[in-house]
């Protein structure tokens, strides 16, 4: 740690004498901050010597000695007073700029230590400080106003005590500004706007700061709008409010409107896009295939997006047919608007019965008129199965339907014993009936088909199963021939 | 010149609340605490509190705390002071008046007179 | 809360004689900043208050020189050297150290 000489840490002098401060290390030394012209500086081995011949008041303050190579960053200090009888400040600035809720510091150094017990703080020309300011004086540094409010930015004079008067400094202005924590607030009304041609349109850019000092501007595209800007004050900022109103709008009017404020911390910036048609319009849209394949018994949503201007005069859910009248109840269909011209209906389709399979149409109307979108729901079954025993050209053959939806296929199985259901271990033989007859196939109803087994003889010790399967499940139906015929039955559930 | 304008007297039924105003004008209105003064007929003056108006914080005289809210409109240069419950013993002349260090500027004052 | 003396309540007077009109605070009202609040008024009938001293012994700009105050700690003194006419009124001391500020009861400046 470098040493002063002399030790301080005050040295009090007068007015025209000399004062050498003398800095040594043990490596090179340096005198921090800018040292005035009064003062010659000197290097003399491993110390630094500053020195004057003809000190005066304005040499008053702290003079900090450092030594670069030090990895500790030790420092020593001198605080030197030069009293004049005539000065007893010395100011270091005019102007001092915190943010409020800071400590200020107003540098005026006391040039004589002795007048500490008779200093105060006043404001500029004797007036007194608001009684709100709280301050506290280091004779080294000057008085600091303890967590500055704006209303504290005035000018303000440091004042000392000399036989009895007050001797006021040089003023001192002291500006408080607000924490200004961001770029102003933007609100961009509409986020986006259609209009017919020829209609009239409004667009408001407004900004908020919290303080009156910042600038916003509307632009159309990459030019500059010149509108009336009004001002206001509410919830403890200050607003700006620029309002573009057009009478007739025209293609011209359209595209991109950018809100930009600025403040000292920044521009924030904020945008929206002006559409001009030339009539109304209705779009009807689905994220969804329109036919649409549901399991009976489970739910289902349909969701239609509608893009439209002006606004819907009306809008349904409506059930086509072909099963029955019923049509869609009102609490199952829902309504979200997206934005101004975006919305979504929904309807709920909750376990679907066999008679709610389908066609439902979705309808909306506006100026532009009538647009529908139409859903078709075809509901999935596990197969059902049957068998019968029958003889078909003097043959016995076996008929199997099966009745599900998607189509069913059909595979024949005989295995070993008398069972309800064939399992592995027992079958004996399998054959896969590739082109079961469909005997019946209308829309949004189950497919029934239809397949023959053969058998000039049935073996009396087995089991001839019909198995149906299809993308929802499957089912079975079993044969067992009897001596005096046959006896059918489906396998235990 | 630096004018204190109030608003006009006020006759009220006890239990409502009052609002009254004080307009500055002929200097910046951010700069200077608004201070609010009571006189009750034939009696000295009482302290009501102070605000800044540029944050809005405020100093009551606990005595009045609950009864009196004072604000600020900025963009008016408005300082107002709301009273509430009132009773007889709120009927008295009120003032708003600058503060610098020291009250300098006062109002004309406002009568509010509560009576049933 | 800081309570302000004033004595005279009331103080009858001829144009042209001295008068003097104390005011005694309960505790100092010396702020923690150094500065003494204490502050003279005067109050017309019908009308507000005027500022006359502030600081102790500061006069208000446009106040007649024949107003002086002084004191220090819990004391102080508005003197008026040669009363005029218009100077009748109620004269108030008040501080504006202490939360909550006061005034003091007033004093009566009144032609005997």
């Known amino acids: 740690i470098p040493v002063i000489e002399p030790s301080g840490p005050e040295l009090v002098v007068k007015p025209g004498e000399t004062v050498t401060l003398r800095c040594v290390g043990n490596g090179s030394v340096e005198w921090d901050g800018p040292i005035s012209p009064h003062w010659t500086l000197y290097s003399d081995g491993p110390s630094s010597v500053l020195t004057t011949n003809n000190a005066t008041f304005q040499n008053t303050r702290t003079y900090r000695c450092t030594e670069p190579g030090d990895p500790l960053g030790g420092s020593a200090a001198i605080h030197l007073y030069v009293k004049d009888p005539a000065r007893p400040w010395n100011v270091l600035a005019k102007e001092v700029v915190v943010f409020e809720d800071q400590d200020a510091l107003l540098p005026c150094l006391l040039t004589d230590p002795v007048l500490e017990a008779g200093v105060s703080l006043v404001r500029l020309r004797g007036r007194p400080l608001l009684r709100h300011t709280n301050y506290s004086f280091s004779p080294w540094h000057g008085f600091i106003i303890h967590r500055a409010k704006f209303i504290q930015g005035q000018d303000y004079q440091c004042s000392a005590l000399m036989g009895g008067r007050k001797v006021m400094s040089i003023s001192i202005r002291l500006k408080v500004q607000k924490v200004i924590p961001g770029p102003p607030a933007l609100t961009l009304v509409p986020a986006e706007l259609v209009r017919i041609r020829g209609e009239a349109a409004q667009i408001v850019c407004s900004a908020s700061n919290i303080d009156v000092d910042f600038d916003v501007f509307l632009q159309h595209n990459t030019t500059k709008l010149a509108i009336p800007q009004r001002s206001d004050f509410h919830d403890n900022r200050y607003q700006k409010v620029l309002t573009l109103s057009l009478g007739q709008v025209d293609f011209q009017h359209a595209g991109n409107y950018s809100c930009v404020a600025s403040n000292v911390q920044g521009k924030h910036s904020t945008s929206m896009f002006f559409q001009v048609v030339e009539s109304a319009y209705l779009d009807l849209s689905s994220e969804q295939n329109l036919i649409q394949e549901v399991t009976v018994g489970e739910g289902l949503n349909l969701k239609v997006m509608v893009e439209a201007y002006p606004g819907l005069q009306g809008f349904n859910w409506t059930y086509l047919g072909p099963f029955s009248d019923h049509q869609p109840e009102p609490k199952l269909a829902n309504a979200t608007t997206k934005d101004t011209y975006r919305h979504t209906f929904t309807l709920s389709l909750p376990r679907l019965k066999p008679s709610e399979a389908g066609r439902y149409s979705f309808l909306a109307r506006n100026p532009g008129g009538w647009r529908a979108l139409t859903f078709e729901l075809t509901l999935r079954y596990p197969p059902e199965v049957s068998v019968i025993w029958t003889s078909i050209n003097g043959s016995g053959t076996l008929l199997c339907a099966a009745s599900g939806y998607p189509q069913p296929n059909v595979t024949w199985l005989q295995c070993a014993g008398h069972t309800d259901r064939c399992d592995e271990a027992q079958v004996l033989q399998v054959w896969v009936d590739p082109h079961p007859e469909v005997l019946s196939q209308e829309p949004f109803q189950k497919v029934t088909v239809q397949s023959l087994l053969t058998a000039e003889t049935l073996e009396h010790n087995q089991t001839y199963e019909c198995r149906a399967h299809n993308s929802v499940g499957s089912g079975s139906w079993a044969f067992i021939p009897i001596s005096a015929g046959a006896r059918t039955h489906p396998p235990d559930e | 010149e630096v004018q204190l304008q109030q608003s006009g007297p006020e006759l009220v039924k006890p239990g409502t609340s009052v609002k009254i105003s004080c307009q500055a004008s002929g200097y910046t209105f951010t700069v200077y605490y608004m201070n609010w003064v009571k006189q009750s007929h034939g009696k000295s003056l009482e302290w009501i509190g102070d605000i800044d108006p540029n944050t809005g914080d405020s100093t009551y005289n606990q005595k009045f705390r609950g009864k009196a809210t004072l604000t600020v409109d900025k963009s008016s240069s408005t300082a107002y002071m709301e009273l509430r419950s009132l009773t007889s013993e709120d009927s008295a002349v009120y003032y708003c008046?600058?503060?610098?260090?020291?009250?300098?500027?006062w109002g004309q004052g406002t009568t509010l007179t509560v009576s049933s | 809360d800081v309570v302000m003396t004033q004595t005279p309540l009331s103080l009858p007077v001829s144009l042209g004689d001295q008068a003097s009109i104390s005011c005694r605070s309960s505790q100092s009202i010396v702020h923690s900043n150094r500065h003494t609040y204490l502050e003279w008024y005067l109050q017309k009938p019908g009308q507000s208050l005027k500022l006359l001293i502030y600081?102790?012994?500061n006069r208000f700009s446009g106040v007649p020189d024949r107003f002086s105050g002084s004191g220090s700690g819990t004391d102080f003194t508005l003197k008026i050297s040669r009363v005029e006419a218009e100077d009748m009124g109620i004269y108030y001391c008040f501080q504006g150290t202490h939360v909550p500020l006061t005034f003091g009861a007033g004093t009566k400046l009144e032609l005997k």
């Open positions: 600081g102790v012994s």
């Open positions: 008046a600058r503060y610098d260090g020291y009250i300098d500027y």
